[in-house]
């Protein structure tokens, strides 16, 4: 009897109520592998989710996020609100990056500006909420009289060292 079930292809299930013959998956269900005793219910893309790929008898539906949200987790298990560049998402919603940090994307968290001095370089272009600093030649490489653009000492964040 076990062998009968193993013959059931994807898109069908082994129906115990009908002498273990292979029955097609009912509407809104699927089986992606052969030999299944039941079909799985199709995922429904509702609310902040939208359908990227319809469910078929052999594969589950695939969801995306509606405009203004982006996918998180395996197989887009969650939709997270987009923020603007220069912001990050918190429980309160989208919040501007703290001084000394930036985010050049609509998702993710604010990261610190690059520490140019780690590579013996100086800051050529100051960082902003949306953009990292641009590092230039080391101070020693600058011609006499030239000065590097150095961001002001941080005022709002404890102990940030953007340089």
């Amino acid at each position: 009897l076990q062998d009968l079930c193993s013959n059931c292809p994807a898109g069908t299930f082994c129906d115990n109520n009908r002498s273990q013959i292979c029955s097609p998956c009912p509407p809104n269900s699927f089986s992606s592998a052969g030999g299944q005793r039941t079909c799985d219910i199709c995922r429904q893309c509702k609310g902040v989710f939208k359908t990227r790929k319809e469910c078929s008898s052999t594969s589950n539906a695939e969801c995306d996020c509606i405009s203004g949200y982006h996918c998180l987790g395996a197989e887009c298990s969650m939709c997270e609100q987009d923020c603007k560049q220069g912001q990050e998402l918190t429980k309160k919603g989208c919040k501007d990056c703290c001084f000394g940090t930036f985010n050049d994307q609509k998702r993710g968290i604010c990261r610190p500006w690059t520490n140019c001095s780690l590579d013996g370089k100086s800051v050529l272009v100051n960082g902003t909420k949306e953009r990292d600093v641009v590092c230039g030649p080391s101070p020693a490489d600058l011609s006499p009289g030239a000065s590097s653009a150095t961001p002001p000492a941080p005022a709002r964040e404890p102990g940030h060292s953007p340089q």
């Epitope: 998180l72 997270e80 990050e88 998402l89 918190t90 429980k91 309160k92 919040k95 703290c98 000394g100 940090t101 993710g108 968290i109 604010c110 990261r111 610190p112 500006w113 690059t114 520490n115 780690l118 990292d132 709002r156 964040e157 404890p158 102990g159 940030h160 060292s161 953007p162």
Partner: antibody
């Protein structure tokens, strides 16, 4: 499997420095903040500061400004915390912890096992 | 600046329900994610609850998180307390999105 493995216990003299390492594995080291937190004997958790290994950007708690230095070696996926001018009050277990790239006010999902630093003359 | 206040100790009999409070001194608790860690002697903290009420994989359902705006507090509730739950519990939030703030910790004693 994500892991943060810290260096072993240290005994230091007052006025000296200590450098604790935190080796990360199982994830992209450059894409997550590493936070440093300490715990004095019988006391609570205290934030020291944090580093973004992707570019070496750092933040320090006011109490540790000028004494703590964070670095990261991306070739070995290892973060370091150096604390100088040690005093007896710095005796504590020092932890590194990872913060997910989900929101700006997120939790620490993985912690190192801790490094006991004892400062004694 | 943000401060989180916890009772130093909570005692409960096995099988009873323990509730640990984390009170926010300023601002609105509804605006802050609160996370909870369990720490046993000689061990690193372990996340029990994150983002107010979410449980990581492997954490028993008897651990739950909630908050109450009228008392401006977050709560860690442990139902059907077991001897193995005896530990220190810390709440965690942020003063800014860079600066974490921890409660002072609560020692849970199982009688």
């Amino acid at each position: 499997e994500v892991q943060l493995v810290q260096s072993g216990a240290e005994v230091k003299k007052p006025g000296s420095s200590v450098k604790v390492s935190c080796k990360a594995s199982g994830y992209t080291f450059t894409s997550y903040y590493i936070y440093w937190v300490r715990q004095a004997p019988g006391q609570g958790l205290e934030w020291i500061g944090n580093i973004w290994p992707g570019n070496g950007g750092t933040f320090y708690g006011e109490k540790f400004m000028g004494r703590a230095t964070f670095t990261a070696d991306t070739s070995t996926s290892t973060a370091y915390m150096e604390l100088s001018s040690l005093r007896s009050e710095d005796t504590a277990v020092y932890y590194c912890a990872r913060r997910p790239d989900y929101s700006g006010d997120d939790y620490f999902d993985y912690w190192g096992q801790g490094t006991l630093v004892t400062v004694s003359s | 600046s943000v401060e989180l206040t916890q009772p130093p100790s909570v005692s409960v009999s096995p099988g009873q329900t323990a509730r640990i409070t984390c009170k926010l001194n300023s601002g609105n608790i509804g605006s802050y994610y609160v996370h909870w860690y369990q720490q046993k002697p000689g061990q690193a903290p372990v996340t029990m609850i994150y983002r107010d009420d979410k449980r990581p994989d492997g954490i028993p359902e008897r651990f739950s998180g909630s908050s109450d705006s009228s008392s401006n507090s977050a709560f860690l509730t442990i139902s059907g307390v077991q001897a193995e739950d005896e530990a220190d519990y810390y709440c965690h939030s942020y003063d800014s999105t860079i600066t974490p703030v921890f409660g002072g910790g609560t020692k849970l004693t199982v009688l």
